[in-house]
Amino acid sequence: ILGGREAEAHARPYMASVQVNGEHLCGGVLVAEQWVLSAAHCLEDAADGKVQVLLGAHSLSQPEPSKRLYDVLRAVPHPDSRPDTIDHDLLLLQLSEKATLGPAVRPLPWQRVDRDVEPGTLCDVAGWGIVSHAGRRPDRLQHVLLPVLDRATCNRRTHHDGAITQRMMCAESNRRDSCKGDSGGPLVCGGVLEGVVTSGSRVCGNRKKPGIYTRVASYAAWIDSVLA
């Protein structure tokens, strides 16, 4: 997260760290007791490493009573996701067992009504991604409030030049932005999960290159079918 600040500890109990061989790789969001939603591209970076999900964490390194690392029973990328595009960049991870819920571990309601968030709406994005252009990684969860950007502006040639489909949304990126390592994490508007950070190799913090988020409402049928 660029231009953000440390999150209040455990105030986002849905927040997950998707890890490979014990290292944070991507963000994720607990959407059901045994399921974490993330970005499909995160799996590509995992190679053949052991994928696990950390829940109940604020600090990645310090011991915390609520922290628990779960093995992944099943990884389900969206069937239409492709390495060379950010389309359908969603991944569902089934935990090896149901998460132990509590004040620091709780699923987040996700948007089912397929309607665009009003441009200008302030939404919260959180993650353990880099906090500087130099690539500094935080130990503790960071967050930032970002205004939603209308799709027409996001599709301008100087922004994303027509690449933003109706199944994506954009948020402003003027120094405050999601960045590398935040992919798969949640964009939360009004207490509801609206978007998942896409995992393209986008420049961060440049206002002409807005953050791109996969709209979960557009994938309600797929999410329901996997969780069923």
Epitope: D150, R151, A152, N155, R157, T158, G162, Q166, K209
Partner: antibody, heavy 116, light 112 residues
Framework: EVQLVESGGGLVQPGGSLRLSCAAS????????INWVRQAPGKGLEWIGD????????DYNADFKRRFTFSLDTSKSTAYLQMSSLRAEDTAVYYC?????????WGQGTLVTVSS | DIQLTQSPSSLSASVGDRVTITCRSS???????????LEWYQQKPGKAPNLLIR???NRFSGVPSRFSGSGSGTDFTLTISSLQPEDFATYYC?????????FGQGTKVEIK
């Protein structure tokens, strides 16, 4: 299939007004800016300006700001170019074009002739 | 406003010829985001322009590989490696980096 269709061109007297329409289909109208470009007979392309179909924000080439106005009817997926105080040098084919990707999609153009 | 000057204004060539059109901008057209929004369009008489090249050198989908773009800063080139009968048209460069966006005056490619 993305389509832009202009209409409203024709013969108009100097000092007169005209409203051109650009009807969009095959995509969600509010997802892309509409730009207007004109081309005088035998001449090059000239950018008039653009409009954001969700916010209504506009940007005009300074040469056209006083006499030309953009508007929208999103329920009809249509953009409009209102032209006033027309003069002979405004005689041109007027195009609308969608921005994104680049100017990949254009209308067929509509000819405006300003003459007495 | 940024001026784009194309040369030559017109040229005569034969099928199979290699054709090069240049476009020079009055100032740099590198955008603040680091990208250069220099595009090339082809226009045939009575028709709307067709997008050929985006961001200096990226061919738009469906554009034949004989069309290529290059350049940086203020000097840009469109090359047609082997001119085909359907390539006789007018070509325009365009900059979208700075408002007002502007077109070059055009280069007409005619049959020799």
């Amino acid at each position: 299939e993305v389509q832009l269709v202009e209409s409203g061109g024709g013969l108009v007297q100097p000092g007169g007004s005209l409203r051109l329409s650009c009807a969009a289909s095959g995509y969600t109208f509010t997802d892309y800016y509409i730009n207007w470009v004109r081309q005088a007979p035998g001449k090059g392309l000239e950018w008039i300006g653009d409009i954001n179909p969700i916010t209504g924000d506009t940007d005009y080439n300074a040469d056209f700001k006083r006499r030309f106005t953009f508007s929208l009817d999103t329920s009809k997926s249509t953009a409009y170019l209102q032209m006033s105080s027309l003069r002979a040098e405004d005689t041109a084919v007027y195009y609308c074009t969608r921005e994104g990707p680049s100017f990949a999609y254009w209308g067929q153009g509509t000819l405006v002739t300003v003459s007495s | 406003d940024i001026q784009l000057t194309q040369s030559p204004s017109s040229l005569s060539a034969s099928v199979g010829d290699r054709v090069t059109i240049t476009c020079r901008s009055s100032q740099t057209i590198v955008h603040s985001n680091g990208d250069t929004y220099l595009e090339w369009y082809q226009q045939k008489p009575g028709k709307a322009p067709n997008l050929l090249i985006r961001k200096v050198s990226n061919r738009f989908s469906g554009v034949p590989s004989r069309f290529s773009g290059s350049g940086s800063g203020t000097d840009f080139t469109l090359t047609i490696s082997s001119l085909q009968p359907e390539d006789f048209a007018t070509y325009y460069c365009f900059q979208g980096s700075h408002v007002p966006v502007t077109f070059g005056q055009g280069t007409k490619v005619e049959i020799k």
